[in-house]
Structures are given as structure tokens and as C-alpha cells.
Amino acid sequence: GSMGHAPKVGRLIYTAGGYFRQSLSYLEAYNPSDGTWLDLADLQVPRSGLAGCVVGGLLYAVGGRNNSPDGNTDSSALDCYNPMTNQWSPCAPMSVPRNRIGVGVIDGHIYAVGGSHGCIHHNSVERYEPERDEWHLVAPMLTRRIGVGVAVLNRLLYAVGGFDGTNRLNSAECYYPERNEWRMITAMNTIRSGAGVCVLHNCIYAAGGYDGQDQLNSVERYDVETETWTFVAPMKHRRSALGITVHQGRIYVLGGYDGHTFLDSVECYDPDTDTWSEVTRMTSGRSGVGVAVTME
């Protein structure tokens, strides 16, 4: 990626890392307002299976692994990208490596959920405080989960689906920070590992994933009031290990793997019309990206 200064634009969809033949170090940003892509500063170490989030206008890349011809190393790294300087800097590492991690942000703190280290599938969860550059373990999930989808709604952290080392999961659970405890919620209608999970209009959406046999294009959403999952329109492409984010009231899904191909497709969901549309293509196909949107 380019090492020049990034343009000072308002809200961009950032995609970091991913996998195509090997783990990638790309950082690219899509501007939905004009359909352009920016090539930004590479990650210092290639990684796939990472997660992305934004805190205080800074982009964080969390966990993953570097799968390269020279070897395969799971990552405990936390790296911070400053859009104003177009530079990455390392932060304190997590207590354990976490590939295929999920992350969520509550009150400016990053929660790192599940993931794997070698064949170990974590149920552990840790919280990062950016102002102190420190990680601390919190209560573990009730279930081991890698390829877990994580979302935050009403200051509660939801962990959805994934793989426990034996089975792909349709179960989901919710973390209550004040009580430091997890509780199971209603299971999804569909087993999903490697799904894209996000929050839009007071609902948790779970898009795509892998059910242990096939990649999925189905999408369902959880209404916290009724505690039910309901299907919405399916995506155009089946995909697992996809990236997902919300931008101006619409869901964007990026890349993934369809069982044959590493997708470059980016689709956008409009909840008003319950439709998906192809909006752009990434510069190359990839799975296992970390995605986040800059704050206003």
C-alpha cells in the first residue's frame, strides 16, 4: 500500500488483511459516496481471520494469523491505524493468539471474543482499554467459538454462531458487562460459522457463513424485543469468512469464500426495501478480512 497521507474524508469502509493463497497485508478503504477505493498503508504483518473495529477515530486490527509459505502463526497482536497519518503502530498484545476472532466495542473498550490458537478453540474473552494500553480477561463465554460473529447492541455484547472444534453452531449468547456474565439467547434458525454479524436498527443481523456442508447466502436478524430470529432477503452470493459493516443505515458485506472462489464482491443491504445489490468489487478476491467504518 501507499505510504502517503490518506485523504481527510468523513466515513470510509476499511478492509484490512484477508486471505488469497496466503495471508494479506492490504489496507484498503471504500468510499460509498463516490465508489472509489483508496490504497493505504499495509499492515506490518500479513494476517487473515482478524477483526477490525474503530475507537476514537482510530482503526484497530485484532488477532488473526499469518498463513504464509514460510509457516503459519496465530496472532495475539493488536495494531492501531491512524487515518490522519496513514500509519500503523503496535499496541499491547492479547493474552493469547486468536485466529478467526470476533470483536465488539462498548464504551470505548474493545472486547476480543473466542478465536483459535492452533487446535485450541477459545471460550475466553478479554477487554482492551485504549487509554491504558492494557488487556484484561473478563468472564468466558459459555461455548468455545471460532469464526464467531460479534455485535454490540444497547451496551450488550452478542456472540453468534461459530465453530467449537467439533460442531458448527447456531447458538448465540449475550454478555452483560455490569454483571460480567454471559447468558444464552435464542438460537438462530441456521447453523452459521464464519458469518457476518452486525447491528442495524435495533436488530442483530447474521449474514452467510458455513453450516458444516455449504456456504450460505441466507440472512436472518434477531429482534431483542421479541427474542426471535427472522429471515430477510438472501445475499446474491453464498459466502463464509466474509467481512461486514454498517454504513449510513445499510449493511455492507465484503469478500469471503463461496466454496470455490475467493470473492471480490461487495453487496449492500437496504432494510427499507429488503434487497441486496452489488455495489462494488474489491481490488482482489479474499476471505477473512477485518472490516470497520470510520466515525463521523
Epitope: 487446535c119 467439533t166 458444516g212 469468512a241 477473512g288
Partner: antibody
Framework: EVQLVESGGGLVQPGGSLRLSCAAS????????IHWVRQAPGKGLEWVAS????????LYAKSVAGRFTISADTSKNTAYLQMNSLRAEDTAVYYC?????????????????WGQGTLVTVSS | DIQMTQSPSSLSASVGDRVTITCRAS??????VAWYQQKPGKAPKLLIY???SLYSGVPSRFSGSRSGTDFTLTISSLQPEDFATYYC?????????FGQGTKVEIK
Amino acid sequence: EVQLVESGGGLVQPGGSLRLSCAASGFAISASSIHWVRQAPGKGLEWVASIDPETGETLYAKSVAGRFTISADTSKNTAYLQMNSLRAEDTAVYYCAILGAWGANAGGGGMDVWGQGTLVTVSS
Amino acid sequence: DIQMTQSPSSLSASVGDRVTITCRASQSVSSAVAWYQQKPGKAPKLLIYSASSLYSGVPSRFSGSRSGTDFTLTISSLQPEDFATYYCQQSYSFPSTFGQGTKVEIK
């Protein structure tokens, strides 16, 4: 019946190429990670490569990285191992195997469905 | 790479004997160890996974245990069909590695 059947082995000259196939029946090859393991004549087992059906990620032993490519076609329920720049030390019986597809915990590493193997001989 | 040092490389035993085969990992592999049986000209068969879990359909005379980085396969009462070569395998970290094998022969 749950089974894997390899094919494509044979005699090839050093520097040559072969493509091995592993056809699954009785279950979906996408149900778990697919591995190739080889065994040189009179020797032990050596893990070669794997592919994750969920992410598409592949892993290779250092001895074959850059020369071998593992892939899968779920529509044909078949996995492949493309072997290029073959060397005498690649001579072996090649087995495909599935990790934990039928009850062995994937985290514990048990490969519980194996093919019968196909012999690859690299010699001039 | 993690080395799995298997011992003995061969042993002679009689039907009814108790047989113990050991694998020592060069570093921690948690419980991510499997054991296989292989007969000449055949593919390996899974016996034990996760160090001590008996795979479905495998006779209960086979058992596995772990003590730190030492892993043991025990055949409590050797049967004629058990004469074969046995391999351990770790899948804790990349790359997965096998022990060199133990050949169990008839005394």
C-alpha cells in the same frame, strides 16, 4: 458407505507434474478439513497439505510449499493435489484424509476417514 | 516444528500381553494427539483422538493417556489382529507431525 478414493498416481520424471484426485462418497467432502498425508516406501507418515472448507485457507508442509497446491471442488465432491517440480524424495503413497468428519473432535486432530492411497514414483 | 519421539520403534509380544507405546512431544501439545493403526498396504485407521478419547467402533482394549508432554497408547490384551504399526500424531500446532512409528510383531 463413507469412503475416499484417490487416483492419479503413477511414474513421473523429476521435474514433472501430477494431479492427484480424492473422490468422496457417502458424505460431503466439504464437511471438514481435507488433508493429504504421504508415506515414502518403508517409512512413516508425513502430513503434506490441508484445505479448510469454511475459509478456503490452505496449509502446506515446508517440503512441498510452492510446488504443491491443494484444492477442492464441492460440486464434484472431490479434492485435488496438484504436484509440480516433482523430486525423487516425493516418491510415496499419497493418502487423502478428512479431519474429524465422523465423530473425532477436530480440535483433537483425529483423521477418521482415509482413502486407500495412490502411489507416486518420481524417477528417471 | 514439534517432534514426536515414539518408542519403542518395534516390540515383540504375545497374544494376551499388555502393550504400551509412548510418544514424547518436544514441547507442549496440550491434548491434541491422535493414535493410528496401520497394516501393510493399508491406510491408517484412527484409534484415539484428543489423547484419550476412544474413536467410535474401536475395541475398548485400546486406550490413550497423557502426562504432560508424554502420551501413551495401551493395548490391554493383545489380539491377533492387533499386530501392526502404530503412529502418534500431534495437531496442536502447524505443521502437524507424526511419530516415527512402532511396529508390534508376534513373539
